[in-house]
Interface confidence: low
């Protein structure tokens, strides 16, 4: 139903990494425009991306207000140049998104190894604590601030001269591992939220290897 020259949006999909959250949909508009609304289950609808010809809408500012809430979005279709026109039921056509709970579902972004330092047979590897767009008291929280000890990192490390990998885990952003003296090692880390059932792991960080000078990064 609806006016003959508008079609309802479809394939509404949440794309979210480290809480940067964009709703995408189809189709590319032909003689129509879209407006998006977002709401928590118990809250009021808030309109975003008014009368846009895009097929995506950045909803980050809304979801970061409370990342543990469950959100629902809907995309309205209007005839281009006649946004007052409605469907046969007296309302514009719209389609609902799947529910989205940022804390549970946002993808973990690719982590970065910030530094490593060798002292004797120990190496301290530090993972960069990435900043998110979640705010508290006007400051942006880091991934660790938001997830606390729900977030762990897994370190994969191996001698540059071999392919046998070892692993270590931490619920902070630092690893202290034993290494063989005189050997160079390569490192990669992965962010993990073990308690999740979906989107549990990030992609692996870029590989960093120990060079001739202590703490030098060499990406391979």
């Amino acid at each position: 139903s609806g006016t003959t020259n508008t079609v309802a949006a479809y394939n509404l999909t949440w794309k979210s990494t480290n809480f940067k959250t964009i709703l995408e949909w189809e189709p590319k508009p032909v003689n129509q425009v879209y407006t998006v609304q977002i709401s928590t289950k118990s809250g009021d609808w808030k309109s975003k991306c008014f009368y846009t010809t895009d097929t995506e809408c950045d909803l980050t500012d809304e979801i970061v207000k409370d990342v543990k809430q469950t959100y629902l979005a809907r995309v309205f279709s209007y005839p281009a140049g006649n946004v007052e026109s409605t469907g046969s039921a007296g309302e514009p056509l719209y389609e609902n998104s799947p529910e989205f709970t940022p804390y549970l579902e946002t993808n973990l972004g690719q982590p970065t190894i910030q530094s490593f330092e060798q002292v004797g047979t120990k190496v301290n590897v530090t993972v960069e604590d990435e900043r998110t767009l979640v705010r508290r008291n006007n400051t942006f929280l880091s991934l660790r601030d938001v997830f606390g000890k729900d977030l762990i990192y897994t370190l994969y490390y191996w001698k540059s001269s071999s392919s046998g990998k070892k692993t270590a885990k931490t619920n902070t952003n630092e690893f202290l591992i034993d290494v063989d003296k005189g050997e160079n090692y390569c490192f990669s880390v992965q962010a993990v939220i073990p308690s999740r059932t979906v989107n549990r792991k990030s992609t692996d960080s870029p590989v960093e290897c120990m060079g001739q000078e202590k703490g030098e990064f060499r990406e391979i």
Partner: antibody, heavy 126, light 107 residues
């Protein structure tokens, strides 16, 4: 009807072991966290820990870590709280409760309780 | 651990009164606070979650408000069955913690 039914009262001696149970019915047992709460005589509520029966993910309060074991058997929709060696100070009422899947819930960090068992009184005395 | 402090520890009121119980968190907990009612020799009953959302089946005379560190439970018109002990609980961070309880007695 959604309910949690706990096993009956227990009287034990110090050093003995014990396993009490909490059986869920009327809902998908594997999809909700179950928690255990202690209430010592005349005192308030203390959160002991929780378990997600779907994958047996378990979290303990630091005060109870190593003192008790929380487990579940999803085939019979039952959660358990057990002690390997009881002490007189374990004398208390123990409640199981289901975590509400409302605002603030995520499987990463669960929320408030909604459904409570009737409680199991455990008395430890020589 | 986050400490939850309820006040008053006890209070006396009459049927029909409007009663307010407060709960203060030692650090900010957003809206992640629940309220429970417990009568003598009975299991607790869930009243409110997410600071202000009523659990299913709870009478509308119960309401909750607050965010951050300060929260209130209000009973707009006390009924005889409301005399009990009330507990707040934060679930913002691990470990979950309860307030010490507020005993509501008949005046």
């Amino acid at each position: 009807e959604v309910q949690l039914v706990q096993s009956g009262a227990e009287v034990k001696k110090p050093g003995e072991s014990l396993k009490i149970s909490c059986k869920g019915s009327g809902y998908s047992f594997t999809s909700y966290w179950i928690g255990w709460v202690r209430q010592m005589p005349g005192k308030g509520l203390e959160w002991m820990g929780i378990i997600y029966p779907g994958d047996s993910d378990t979290r303990y309060s630091p005060s109870f870590q190593g003192q008790v074991t929380i487990s579940a058997d999803k085939s019979i929709s039952t959660a358990y709280l057990q002690w390997s060696s009881l002490k007189a100070s374990d004398t208390a009422m123990y409640y199981c409760a289901r975590i509400h899947r409302g605002a603030g819930y995520s499987s990463s960090w669960p929320g408030a309780f909604d459904i409570w068992g009737q409680g199991t009184m455990v008395t430890v005395s020589s | 651990d986050i400490q939850m402090t309820q006040s008053p520890s006890s209070l006396s009121a009459s049927v029909g009164d409007r009663v307010t119980i407060t709960c203060r968190a030692s650090q900010g907990i957003s809206r992640w606070l629940a309220w429970y009612q417990q009568k003598p020799e009975k299991a607790p009953k869930s009243l409110i979650y997410a600071a202000s959302s009523l659990q299913s089946g709870v009478p509308s005379r119960f309401s909750g408000s607050g965010s951050g560190t300060d929260f209130t439970l209000t009973i707009s018109s006390l009924q005889p069955e409301d005399f009990a002990t009330y507990y707040c609980q934060q679930y913002d961070s691990d470990p979950i913690t309860f307030g010490q309880g507020t005993r509501l007695e008949i005046k």
